[in-house]
Interface confidence: low
């Protein structure tokens, strides 16, 4: 059993209340985290509660405001960025969201030395991306798909690229599919460590088919949104990487970095770029059939001002049992010799672990090992490597931070976080200052989140940065549900689950069960984190039992589980949810006539297939923004797990795994189908096709669309959505309103 915030005494029980839906929709019980904005080994910036930008020096204990809330407010700034030479700050306003990571904004440059905004040669608007060089105060920015450079904020810009065109050529920013499925960033440009060079990607979407959907707005005629979006098997973007010398950008102009021959021989992706030194860069490439990745280390040839990527510096990573990497191929963390690096990939037993590569991948030295997985390398210093894993006490849904001493032999390992606040904190991330002099630990649960500052040498806690006292006080009179994380062993498969139980849970009674599912490849739902959300309310107020199950295809438990779904999406994920439900029924406290399942996105796909499994287990279910056929989803994501929808590859399973193929099986369940009409990610087309198939099969169902809403169904739609789903479930479970 996971302990929640301390309970008040029974005498005060009558003052306790259940969670309400309003609590959830208002965000009454949301928590805060504190991530320092590090600017040196011992200094960080933080935006105070009253919106001043404050610089903290850990060693002197001093703090001072570098930018007042008055200055911030004068341009309605919602974000800021200090130049590394500390002479200027950019202020970001007029934030306008585009896709998951991308947005445009207006930028103002404030000169800290004279306390005035820089006038003359102001930046154009709106800008798609802007960043300082890592040293000094050069600016690189993307405007109308072209990259510009300023040596100083007040200087006229130097235009680096000229061919940028909306929806055609993207320079320094990703197109839709690279943003969502490969880079997971809004930018595609990278400064070298001292700002000498600027590397950038150019994406050519000229030949990509376009998804078009109506945006209704308020006008007489709807607008049409057009996005180059490669669905499975379609033509993909063509990517090229260029590097330009920013000291004298016009001298040779941008130089293209060559693609490794074994990659360039067929369709490929660029997956990431890591600068090693100012004159050494590491690029990662991936074949379109994503089981071969090549890491290529390139050196600047000053004689011809070109980038040389010798075959001897190509490192191949190949998977024979699935796709390369986890969700993404991991990125290298280079050591101080600027050629060897640390990287996470599968070991011979099929667990993702840290390896040290000095010359070849074949000769890699394994740094961590065991039937658990290394998840992230945070920092490598000259004597330590900091990483996170789920090793401790064999709970895959935990994250602890470890330090390996690489300066000594044999290397020694220490868990930095395992015993700090053991009951409260089992899921950590970390943020390190320069040279790991200090670091912040951010604990996400299972108790109330807490952020702390630590000495990078001794690991000693220096101070609490954020402990969510107000939240703790607010929760004192709330009857929170109980949570437990356990596992089921079924046919040599371990199914970890999280069960959320009503506050007065009694094993001898029967409760309605709601399965919340995501289930996508390399995801994890069963995590030791704190949350007060919709399902907390359903357990607290409506007396439901909610369960989350990590089945085959999910992450951090080895390749056997992860790659089980390779080329077979929609089979084992569904089977494992059903298996778990049967096991829950055997536990004796589930009312088997009142079982529901719901999910969003991939979870909507799984919940739909589970409802249409013909098992008779589910009374009802909800699919929010589901995928309905893998032929409708993005190439980069889909083909990673499914291969190509061609006769000689995997077309048959593409066809067999659709929701539409199972339309008849929805006849005996109550189905609520929900989708936003402006979903750029999982297109409304998916739900439109489900609805059409159900109508053609003369199957009754319920549906809700959200006009002009995207995949996140945000704003007022969120309130409407959860209210609507609550009514649906309460009706399904015969719970009074």
């Amino acid at each position: 059993i996971v302990l929640r915030p301390s309970r008040v005494h029974n005498s005060e029980e009558n003052t306790m209340r259940a969670l309400t839906l309003k609590d959830i929709l208002n965000g009454t019980f949301s928590y805060k985290t504190f991530f320092p904005n590090w600017i040196s080994g011992q200094e960080y910036l933080h935006q105070s509660a009253d919106n001043n930008i404050v610089l903290y020096n850990i060693e002197t204990g001093q703090s001072y405001t570098i930018l007042s809330n008055r200055t911030m407010k004068s341009v309605n700034a919602s974000n800021y960025g200090l130049s590394p030479d500390r002479q200027f700050v950019y202020l970001e306003s007029d934030y306008s969201k585009l896709w998951r990571y991308s947005y445009t904004a207006t930028y103002y440059i404030y000169d800290l030395s004279n306390g005035e905004f820089v006038r003359g040669n102001e930046l154009p608007r709106p800008i798609q991306y802007l960043c300082w060089s890592p040293v000094g105060s050069k600016l690189a920015y993307v405007y109308q798909n072209n990259i510009y450079l300023k040596q100083r904020p007040g200087d006229p810009p130097f235009q680096i690229t000229f061919n940028g065109r909306e929806n055609k050529i993207f320079n320094g920013i990703p197109d839709w599919v690279y943003e969502e499925e490969m880079l997971a960033t809004k930018y595609a440009l990278w400064w070298s460590p001292n700002g000498k060079f600027l590397a950038y990607a150019e994406f050519n979407d000229t030949d990509i088919p376009v998804i078009a959907y109506s945006y209704y707005g308020d006008e007489q005629y709807p607008r049409t949104i057009n996005i180059p979006y490669p669905k499975a098997g379609a033509k993909n973007p063509v990517v090229r990487i260029f590097i330009i010398d920013t000291t004298y950008p016009a001298y040779v102009g941008p130089q293209e970095v060559p693609v490794p021959a074994m990659i360039a021989s067929s369709d490929y992706y660029f997956s990431w770029l890591t600068w090693v030194t100012d004159e050494r860069v590491c690029l990662q490439w991936l074949k379109r059939v994503q089981n071969v990745s090549v890491l290529s280390i390139c050196d600047f040839r000053e004689d011809w001002q070109t980038w040389d990527c010798p075959k001897t510096q190509e490192h191949i990573e190949e998977s024979r049992t699935g796709w390369a990497g986890g969700f993404f191929v991991s990125t290298p963390v280079f050591s101080y010799d600027a050629i060897s690096y640390y990287k996470i990939f599968s070991d011979k037993d099929g667990y993702k672990h840290i390896h040290y590569i000095k010359d070849t991948v074949e000769n890699a030295i394994q740094i961590t090992s065991g039937k658990w997985e290394a998840i992230n390398i945070f920092r490598v210093t000259q004597d330590s490597l900091f990483y996170s894993s789920n090793e401790f006490e064999e709970y895959p849904g935990r994250r602890n931070i470890y330090r390996i001493s690489i300066g000594s032999y044999p290397p020694s390992k220490k868990c930095v976080t395992c015993h700090l606040r053991k009951e409260r904190c089992q899921y950590y991330t970390a943020s390190f200052s320069d040279y790991a002099k200090y670091y912040a630990l951010v604990c996400y649960g299972p108790g109330i989140p807490i952020s702390t500052l630590h000495d990078g040498r001794t690991d000693q806690e220096i101070k609490i940065l954020e402990e969510n006292k107000e939240l703790e006080n607010a929760l004192k009179n709330i009857q929170l549900p109980k949570e437990e994380i356990k596992k089921l062993e079924v046919d040599e498969i371990t199914l970890w689950y999280k069960m959320i139980l009503p506050p007065q849970f009694d094993r001898s009674k029967k409760y309605p069960l709601l399965i919340q599912v995501y289930g996508g490849p390399c995801s994890q739902s069963v995590r030791s984190v704190f949350a007060v959300n919709w399902i907390s309310y359903l357990a607290s107020k409506e007396g439901m039992v909610i369960a989350l199950v990590d089945g085959r295809g999910t992450a951090f438990q080895g390749d056997k589980l992860l790659y089980a779904v390779y080329r077979k999406l929609g089979v084992y994920e569904v089977e494992d949810q059903i298996t778990a439900v049967r096991k829950f029924i055997e536990m004796g406290f589930i009312d088997e006539k009142r079982i529901a399942i719901w999910g969003w996105s991939y979870g909507g796909y799984v919940s739909s297939l589970a409802l249409a499994s013909g098992t008779g287990l589910f009374k009802c279910g909800i699919a929010v923004a589901p995928v309905s056929s893998w032929e409708y989803y993005a190439s980069v994501y889909t083909e990673r797990f499914m291969g190509l929808p061609t006769k000689d590859d995997n077309l048959e399973h593409y066809k067999n795994s659709t929701v539409m193929a199972r339309a008849e099986y929805f006849r005996n369940v109550d189905y609520l189908l929900i989708h936003g009409t402006a979903d750029d990610n999982v297109h409304f087309q998916n739900s439109a096709q489900i609805a059409k198939a159900l109508v053609n099969a003369q199957v009754d169902f319920q549906a809700m669309w959200y006009s002009d809403q995207n995949h996140g169904l945000s704003g007022l739609s969120t309130n409407h959505l959860y209210t609507h789903m609550t009514h649906f479930l309460k009706q399904c479970f015969s719970l009074s309103d």
């Epitope: 004298y248 040839r301 004689d303």
Partner: antibody
């Protein structure tokens, strides 16, 4: 401000060699190409070759291959051009130039006269 | 080697009037990155050459805006919108699309 200062005028006999120096001051020397360009009396500019001091590998125009050697000494920020087997048609002003994007820097020129 | 051909070789001009010099290369100077690797230089009498235009069309630092460069691939033009007396000298185009750079023969601009 970057300045390239070249060595003084030379008078050489046919068949001999000449070595012209070019010292950079007031800016970064190493990462940028130092080119050597010559101009015979009343004639146009002729690119002879170049070197990036950081790398030390020189490139030469085909016409001068085997006769010209371009070197650089990073420690003194000096580039050198040595031309051997001199003939009368090598009489010219020899310039060193540093490429640098939107501006360039040239030496004042060194007059080499080849005469018997 | 890439051969650069300039025309005319001599250009008498009237102050205040426009002037134009052409430069043709034996191979395309358009790089795959979209830049044309062609520069224009002016050598005034008794001086070292000075850079006027780089990458086909970009004015070098401190160059008056009466100078402009255009063209792509193999054909390039340098234009002076209104010639001034100080513009006299020899104008050279230079390619740097490959490792071995080459100059044009030069165009001598003099006042009529």
């Amino acid at each position: 401000q970057v300045q390239l200062v070249q060595s003084g005028a030379e008078v050489k006999k046919p068949g001999s060699s000449v070595k012209v120096s070019c010292k950079a001051s007031g800016g970064t020397f190493s990462p940028y190409t130092i080119s050597w360009v010559r101009q015979a009396p009343g004639q146009g500019l002729e690119w002879m070759g170049g070197i990036v001091p950081n790398v030390g590998v020189a490139t030469y125009a085909q016409k001068f291959q085997g006769r010209v050697t371009i070197t650089a000494d990073k420690s003194t920020s000096t580039a050198y051009m040595e031309l051997s087997s001199l003939r009368s048609e090598d009489t010219a002003v020899y310039y060193c130039a540093r490429d640098a994007a939107d501006r360039d820097y040239w030496g004042q020129g060194t007059t080499v006269t080849v005469s018997s | 080697d890439i051969v650069m051909t300039q025309s005319p070789l001599s250009l008498p001009v009237t102050p205040g009037e426009p002037a134009s010099i052409s430069c043709r290369s034996s191979q395309s100077l358009l790089h795959s990155n979209g830049y044309n690797y062609l520069d224009w230089y002016l050598q005034k009498p008794g001086q070292s050459p000075q850079l006027l235009i780089y990458l086909g069309s970009n004015r070098a630092s401190g160059v008056p805006d009466r100078f402009s460069g255009s063209g792509s691939g193999t054909d390039f033009t340098l234009k002076i919108s209104r010639v001034e007396a100080e513009d006299v000298g020899v104008y050279y185009c230079q390619q740097r699309n490959n490792k071995n750079r080459t100059f044009g023969q030069g165009t001598k601009v003099e006042i009529k």
